[in-house]
């Protein structure tokens, strides 16, 4: 099985403890790691961060370690926006352009292939995106004819069905990708005005309509109606929860909310917290499990925060693995107890970990 | 090739303050890796201290993190160990290590015998 | 934190014998480290992840083990050997060595 685990640059930002580098990442841990994200400038691939020449250096050093890690940059993300590859993929020599500047860059810097992350391709991108997946994977078949091994070409795709539906020709780019990541998380925000898991595996007994699609069960099972080949379908587990700021006394699943949580200590985004930052929170909060979405909860005061822990990975990769899929995806590492000194347990990435053991057991 | 030397007092009184200094030579410590405290006991057990990764940020072993400080000066590349409040059992010899993966010590300063007695 | 059980803590060979020594971790890691000490000198990185051979270590040496138990081996003993070896992990937070087994020439 794959075990795809996506580092953040910008993490090497976050204060104290919560502050990670490259060099922290377990080489052992994971069988793919892609480093998070890369710019395009005048239609080429392009670093995003001052320091990113050297994280690139600090993460490929890994594979001096473990020959068989492979590393990927992942170019786009959310701060990329989306218009920006629109112009990029709907013009034909800025395309070409773009496609021909990022196997010299990729080899340059050590990696073993490229992570598409647009987020996410309008209803009028949806030709040009399998164009540029197509495009893509043609110059990398070009470019290893002289026997280098060939790039890794994979996307990033989101779960939610309305997306699915408007950005992606799933049967045609599956063809062309290695694997893809489907983004299996984040189906339940503070838009929805209510409390709500944004990772469930499974349909919960609460969920009323539209949100029969806004679980991971139902968005694997799309994506494979719609071709996707279960070899090629690494499903996306979140080291992160989603937090809301309750609005009465309710504290159960569906309960009013006034708006997003209160910003972690470390990651400082309101509506956020890293595991770790959870591990913290938990000292002191009352837990519940939602036992049909096999997810947890947990509430303190008027914090909810909906999460993944131990137990619900293990669901999740048992669930991977009836379905045949390509393995785990997870965002991201730096965001699990990267240094083991928050969790209680003192092992060093304990979500991935756990991912990994559920993985490989037989 | 990267080397590490330890200076600093071989005696300190109880209650006091332990500083040491770690001189690194053929490698700039704001350039990669991160630079550990190291001690051994008299009875030959050892425990890691702490660290100051390149970026500055740091690390502490939890059974010291209410007494440890390791701080850089960057223009000397140097690096600091301070543990305060020291006692008797903080006899050691104190080494300073840089990594090569994260969780190992691939290359070590000789050490530096710290007495801690009245 | 995970406490690491070298044995035994002392044992003597005679050159040429075969030595075999391990190390138990009182939880699973996902790999482990060893060094050498030689009196009055800092430990040397000898064997990485679980059983690479740090530059300079003779090819008798080799090192294995997985999950809570390792061990470090000598094919063919000789007096240079002589040394403590102490055991390292930092799977779990905070790093930690083992105690050490001091290996003797007969």
């Known amino acids: 099985y794959k075990l795809v685990c996506y580092y953040t640059s910008w993490s090497q930002y976050r204060e104290g403890d919560g502050s990670c580098f490259p060099d922290a990442l377990d080489r052992f841990l994971c069988t793919h790691i892609i480093y998070s994200f890369a710019n395009i400038s005048n239609d080429h691939i392009d670093t995003w961060e001052w320091n990113d020449v050297t994280l690139y250096g600090m993460l490929n050093t890994l594979k001096n370690r473990n020959p068989n890690l492979k590393t990927l940059l992942s170019v786009g993300g959310w701060n990329f926006g989306s218009q920006r590859f629109s112009k990029i993929a709907s013009n034909t020599q800025s395309r070409r352009t773009f496609i021909k500047s990022v196997p010299p860059f990729l080899r340059t810097h050590g990696f073993d292939g490229l992570d598409l992350a647009w987020l996410y391709p309008g209803r009028r991108d949806k030709q040009h995106f399998t164009t540029l997946i197509k495009e893509m994977k043609a110059e990398f078949i070009k470019e290893a004819q002289p026997g280098k091994k060939q790039l890794l070409l994979s996307a990033a795709l989101s779960a939610g069905k309305v997306t699915i539906d408007s950005s992606y020709d799933i049967a045609k780019i599956s063809q062309h990708l290695d694997f893809i990541s489907i983004m299996t998380y984040d189906f339940h925000g503070a838009w929805r005005g209510t409390t709500g898991h944004h990772s469930p595996l499974f349909r919960g007994q609460e969920d009323a309509s539209p949100d029969r699609f806004s679980n991971t069960d139902y968005a694997v099972g799309y994506m494979l109606r719609l071709g996707a080949p279960a070899s090629k379908l690494v499903m996306g587990i979140p080291t992160f929860g989603r937090s809301f700021t309750l609005a009465s006394s309710e504290t159960g699943v569906g309960a009013p909310i006034s708006g997003p949580g209160i910003p972690g200590r470390f990651t400082k985004e309101a509506g956020t917290l890293a595991y770790y930052e959870i591990c913290d929170f938990l000292r002191g909060a009352t837990v519940h499990r939602i036992l049909g979405q096999q997810v947890p909860y947990a509430t303190k005061g008027n914090q909810w925060v909906g999460y993944d822990d131990q137990e619900s990975v293990k669901s999740k990769v048992q669930y991977l693995k009836d379905r045949q899929l390509a393995g785990a995806m997870v965002w991201a590492l730096d965001l699990d107890d990267f240094q083991g000194s928050f969790c209680g347990q003192d092992l060093r990435f304990p979500l991935t970990n756990a991912i990994k053991d559920a993985l490989a057991a037989t | 090739d990267v080397q590490l030397q330890e200076s600093g007092p071989d005696l300190v009184k109880p209650s006091q303050s332990l500083s040491l200094t770690c001189t690194v030579t053929?490698?700039?410590?704001?350039?990669?890796?991160?630079w550990h405290w190291i001690r051994q006991f008299p009875g030959n057990k050892l425990e890691w201290m702490g660290y100051i990764h390149y970026s500055g940020t740091t690390n502490y072993n939890p059974s010291l993190k209410s007494r440890i400080s390791i701080t850089r000066d960057t223009s000397k590349n140097q690096f600091f160990l301070q543990l305060n409040s020291v006692t008797t059992e903080d006899t050691a010899t104190y080494s300073c290590?840089?990594?090569?993966?994260?969780?190992?010590?691939?290359?070590w300063g000789q050490g530096t015998l710290v007495t801690v007695s009245a | 934190q995970i406490v690491l059980t070298q044995s035994p803590a002392i044992m003597s060979a005679s050159p040429g014998e075969k030595v075999t020594m391990t190390c138990s971790a009182s939880?699973?890691?996902?790999?482990m480290h060893w060094y050498q000490q030689k009196s009055g000198t800092s430990p040397k990185r000898w064997i990485y992840?679980?059983?690479k051979l740090a530059s300079g270590v003779p090819a008798r040496f080799s090192g294995s083990g997985s999950g809570t138990s390792y061990s470090l081996t000598i094919s063919s003993m000789e007096a240079e050997d002589a040394a403590t070896y102490y055991c390292?992990?930092?799977?779990?937070?905070?790093?930690?060595f083992g105690s050490g087994t001091k290996l003797e020439i007969k």
């Open positions: 290590a840089r990594n090569y993966g994260y969780d190992e010590f691939a290359y």
């Open positions: 992840d679980t059983s």
């Open positions: 053929g490698y700039s410590i704001t350039s990669g890796y991160s």
């Open positions: 390292q992990q930092w799977s779990s937070n905070p790093p930690t």
């Open positions: 939880s699973s890691v996902s790999y």
